[in-house]
């Protein structure tokens, strides 16, 4: 390799100081070693994003409208595998429980709040509104293009993209993945959805010059608005029930 970088994660610091001079990359903000042949976990990416904000780095910063969930960005606690810890707290000792995509699923409390487990988000619904086109996209062509995108770019196994719905101008992409279905090397739907969200916003986490290039029969797909809904294996525990939109 002509230099030591992480093709799948811009938010890393890489060096060849490891055994045998092998290129090793650590996530900014956490110093956790990342596997650059696959997607980095959303928790480590959020942590890196917050550390970049604090240090004033201009790399891959969110647009002013970037909203991950109803609470906005926060500096998460990740476990040693880079996954979200069940309980998250801010600097003022306000705590809450999160699901596996890091979205709050309980009311906020104090440090006595208990979160027994990270509840898995097993169903992610990505809703896109595309820019007006001369004519509607062919549903079948759109379906195969989006399936190809998730398989090729994010390495998500095709079985985890359960459906693509289309009613012009709204596209819905359904990702489903139970804990029992996810193999050791399988990309998590949470990570695929987050990379896709950043790609759509023009904030790609990949190193290369190539941005997202989604086109159906030669017609580019330009996304105007994105909404992401997360459904957990257990219902959220809000005093007033609501579906979490990202």
């Amino acid at each position: 390799q002509s230099n030591c970088t992480c093709p799948t994660n811009k938010m890393t610091v890489c060096d060849t100081n490891g055994p045998g001079g092998v290129c090793q990359c650590r996530a900014m903000g956490s110093q956790v070693l990342v596997d650059c042949s696959t997607l980095t976990s959303k928790c480590l990416l959020l942590k890196a994003r917050m550390s970049a904000r604090k240090s004033g780095r201009s790399l891959v910063m969110p647009s002013e409208h970037a909203i991950l969930d109803n609470d906005g960005l926060y500096d998460p606690e990740c476990d040693d595998k880079g996954r979200f810890k069940a309980r998250q707290c801010n600097q003022t000792s306000v705590c809450w429980c999160v699901n596996s995509v890091g979205v709050r699923r309980t009311d906020k409390g104090d440090q006595s709040l208990r979160c027994d487990e990270v509840v898995r988000t097993h169903h992610i619904l990505i809703e896109l509104r595309h820019r007006p086109t001369d004519r509607a996209f062919n549903h079948s062509d759109l379906d195969s293009e989006l399936r190809r995108l998730f398989q090729e770019r994010y390495k998500l196994h095709p079985s985890f993209l359960s459906a693509v719905h289309y009613e012009e101008p709204t596209i819905q992409i359904e990702l489903r993945q139970n804990a029992s279905q996810k193999g050791l090397r399988d990309v998590d739907i949470a990570d695929a959805a987050y990379y896709f969200e950043r790609d759509i916003k023009g904030e790609s986490l990949f190193m290369g010059r190539r941005g997202l290039d989604v086109q159906v029969r030669g017609e580019p797909l330009h996304v105007e608005r994105t909404l992401i809904y997360y459904l957990d294996e257990k219902p959220p525990q809000f005093s007033m029930k609501r579906l979490t939109a990202g």
């Epitope: 390799q1 002509s2 093709p7 799948t8 190809r148 995108l149 290369g208 190539r210 290039d213 030669g218």
Partner: antibody, heavy 126, light 105 residues
Framework: AVTLDESGGGLQTPGGGLSLVCKAS????????MFWVRQAPGKGLAWVGV????????NYAPAVKGRATISRDNGQSTVRLQLNNLRAEDTGTYYC???????????????????WGHGTEVIVSS | ALALTQPSSVSANPGETVEITCSGG???YGWFQQKSPGSAPVTVI????YRLSDIPSRFSGSASGSTATLTITGVRVEDEAVYFC??????????FGAGTTLTVL
């Protein structure tokens, strides 16, 4: 079956320019990246460049950067390599190749080539 | 790197298993067979481990980190050829190895 037919090779003069054309058939041309690869006599394969599906992105090897232009016509299912300021070291067989992974973060990789043309021979000599 | 690193030659008896390694790439690896100089290469493996439908099942590919391996299980005389690996460098410029000559004894 996928077929890639290159044309436009032959004897070229140093300092001049050449235009190679590759005609594709047997697949949905509009859905795939296209590559050019060359091989000097008695040498190995050398990646020349790539163009994405829409033609909005190209990438070139350092040896040809600034001298090469890859373009495509999706209506005609053709891809063209224009190479200017020719040198003796540009001599070789030029292959057109089909990419297989247009969305991949490493889509420019030679590891994404799944089909090759028969090649067209270029000789740069005075 | 200006080229990927692969052995210049390997040899084996018919029926044996042959492994050819390739290192120094960043991204997907492919393997290409060229039976004679000037003849068109044939893709044997693309995207690390995908085999084209008309390629015999004795050919397989794997990749780990920045190293890829082409394995021919039960090599045959007709497999004699030069095998090139392909990938990219970390600046996304495509790369090939110098080629490995496989001799079946």
């Amino acid at each position: 079956a996928v077929t890639l037919d290159e044309s436009g090779g032959g004897l070229q003069t140093p300092g001049g320019g050449l235009s190679l054309v590759c005609k594709a058939s047997g697949f949905d041309f509009i859905d795939y990246d296209m590559f050019w690869v060359r091989q000097a006599p008695g040498k190995g394969l050398a990646w020349v460049g790539v163009i994405n599906r829409s033609g909005s992105y190209t990438n070139y090897a350092p040896a040809v950067k600034g001298r090469a232009t890859i373009s495509r016509d999706n209506g005609q299912s053709t891809v063209r390599l224009q190479l200017n300021n020719l040198r003796a070291e540009d001599t070789g067989t030029y292959y057109c190749a089909k990419g297989v992974c247009t969305h991949c973060w490493d889509a420019d990789s030679a590891g994404n080539i799944d089909a090759w043309g028969h090649g067209t021979e270029v000789i740069v000599s005075s | 790197a200006l080229a990927l690193t692969q052995p210049s030659s390997v040899s084996a008896n018919p029926g044996e298993t042959v492994e050819i390694t390739c290192s120094g790439g960043s991204g997907n690896y492919g393997w290409f067979q060229q039976k004679s100089p000037g003849s068109a290469p044939v893709t044997v493996i693309y995207n690390n481990n995908y085999r084209l439908s008309d390629i015999p099942s004795r050919f397989s590919g794997s990749a780990s980190g920045s190293t890829a391996t082409l394995t021919i299980t039960g090599v045959r005389v007709e497999d004699e050829a030069v095998y090139f690996c392909g990938s990219a460098d970390s600046t996304y410029v495509g790369l090939f190895g110098a080629g490995t000559t496989l001799t079946v004894l």
